[in-house]
């Protein structure tokens, strides 16, 4: 499965939109910084078959989409930017879903993927727990925005490596 060129453009657009969504200085929120345990090893791309990598990317985008689709998120960000960001993520999910079906087959999800997917879910659970504990404060959302920018950058790099393998 070849991810369309528009997919990588969408990736870059999503990162630009997320950067634009920043409302307060990251420096004013340094005291709120937090380690969410991003599973970098799941995104280095070396030990992966393509189907595995696509499934992990899909989970990453899906969880990001879920995180920014909540009521609390709607209250935190400028609505038009949030909508554009969500639309980019939704398009990426469609591209990746088409690839998952092509690479893996409609019926089976390889069990070898599951541990990697669970690592991504665990990471997002820690993000949602942090937001809850911080009562969805502006600084908490800023910390999370910066964190998601970092994790989406890893996703973008993994996608680049996948294209080079093709």
């Amino acid at each position: 499965c070849d991810l369309p060129q528009t997919h990588s453009l969408g990736n870059r657009r999503a990162l630009i939109l997320l950067a634009q969504m920043g409302r307060i200085s990251h420096f004013s929120c340094l005291k709120d910084r937090h380690d969410f345990g991003f599973p970098e090893e799941e995104f280095d791309g070396h030990q992966f078959q393509k189907a595995q990598a696509i499934s992990v990317l899909h989970e990453m985008i899906q969880q990001t989409f879920n995180l920014f689709s909540t009521e609390d998120s709607s209250a935190a960000w400028e609505q038009s930017l949030l909508e554009k960001f969500s639309t980019e993520l939704y398009q990426q999910l469609n591209d990746l879903e088409a690839c998952v079906i092509q690479e893996v087959g409609v019926e089976e999800t390889p069990l070898m993927n599951e541990d990697s997917i669970l690592a991504v879910r665990k990471y997002f659970q820690r993000i949602t727990l942090y937001l809850t504990e911080k009562k969805y404060s502006p600084c908490a959302w800023e910390v999370v925005r910066a964190e998601i920018m970092r994790s989406l950058s890893f996703s973008t790099n993994l996608q680049k490596r996948l294209r080079r393998k093709d």
Epitope: P39, N66, A119, R126, T128
Partner: antibody, heavy 122, light 107 residues
Framework: EVQLVQAGAEVKAPGESLRISCKVS????????ISWVRQIPGKGLEWMVK????????IYNPSFQGHVSISVDKSITTVYLQWSSLQASDTAIYYC???????????????WGQGTLVAVSS | DIQMTQSPSSLSASVGDSVTITCRAS??????FHWYRQKPGKAPELLIY???NLQTGVPSRFTGSGSGTECTLTITSLQPDDFATYYC?????????FGQGTKLDVR
């Protein structure tokens, strides 16, 4: 096959320290939370604490915070529960459990160890 | 803490019967309800997760339903293996909490 194998029963005196273990196998250790659950004989289940083996990030039940501590050794895929000073009221069966996480981030306990009986008596 | 209250605390039934156990949460837990069975001298085992999903390998005579503050576990066509203690659990809020248990014994 996913397995959580716990150490055997322990008999201790009040004031003594103790560390019990849970050795896991059959999956990627760092991808799943592990919790400890207490069951006082003849009573119900109480969730104590959970740990992310990837970086030892922990979440405690406030009822147990300060009295027990959880830790992991990634090199031997083992989770520990430790007391520095046991009390008679710690007499119970302790289970280690693996969490599964759904896509909507719902936790549930899909695999349980066989349990370790800890008896504290003078 | 979210309190989980099971009813009844105990019940008697015969092989082949159907039984229903109810669990009430002190506040909404969405569908973060789970059910476990504990046989005497054994560790608990997962039966139902997220209120209504059957765990792999669990017979279809077990069904779960409900969401919000109440959920139910129904067991149809009771088998000898089913006489045990059943616990509900919520994982919506910390600390995670269990119901006090329902002991199902032979009439």
């Amino acid at each position: 096959e996913v397995q959580l194998v716990q150490a055997g029963a322990e008999v201790k005196a009040p004031g003594e320290s103790l560390r019990i273990s849970c050795k896991v196998s059959g999956y990627t250790f760092t991808s799943y939370w592990i919790s400890w659950v207490r069951q006082i004989p003849g009573k119900g289940l109480e969730w104590m604490v959970k740990i992310d083996p990837r970086d030892s990030y922990t979440i405690y039940n406030p009822s147990f915070q300060g009295h027990v501590s959880i830790s992991v050794d990634k090199s031997i895929t083992t989770v520990y529960l430790q007391w520095s000073s046991l009390q008679a009221s710690d007499t119970a069966i302790y289970y280690c459990v693996r969490h599964y996480l759904t896509q909507s981030l719902v936790d549930y306990f899909d695999h349980w160890g066989q349990g370790t009986l800890v008896a504290v008596s003078s | 803490d979210i309190q989980m209250t099971q009813s009844p605390s105990s019940l008697s039934a015969s092989v082949g019967d159907s039984v229903t156990i109810t669990c009430r949460a002190s506040q909404s837990v969405s569908n973060y309800f789970h059910w476990y069975r504990q046989k005497p001298g054994k560790a608990p085992e997962l039966l139902i997760y997220s209120a209504s999903n059957l765990q792999t390998g669990v017979p279809s005579r077990f069904t779960g339903s409900g969401s919000g503050t109440e959920c139910t576990l129904t067991i149809t066509s009771l088998q000898p293996d089913d006489f045990a203690t059943y616990y509900c659990q919520q994982t919506h809020g910390y600390p995670f909490t269990f119901g006090q248990g329902t002991k199902l014994d032979v009439r």
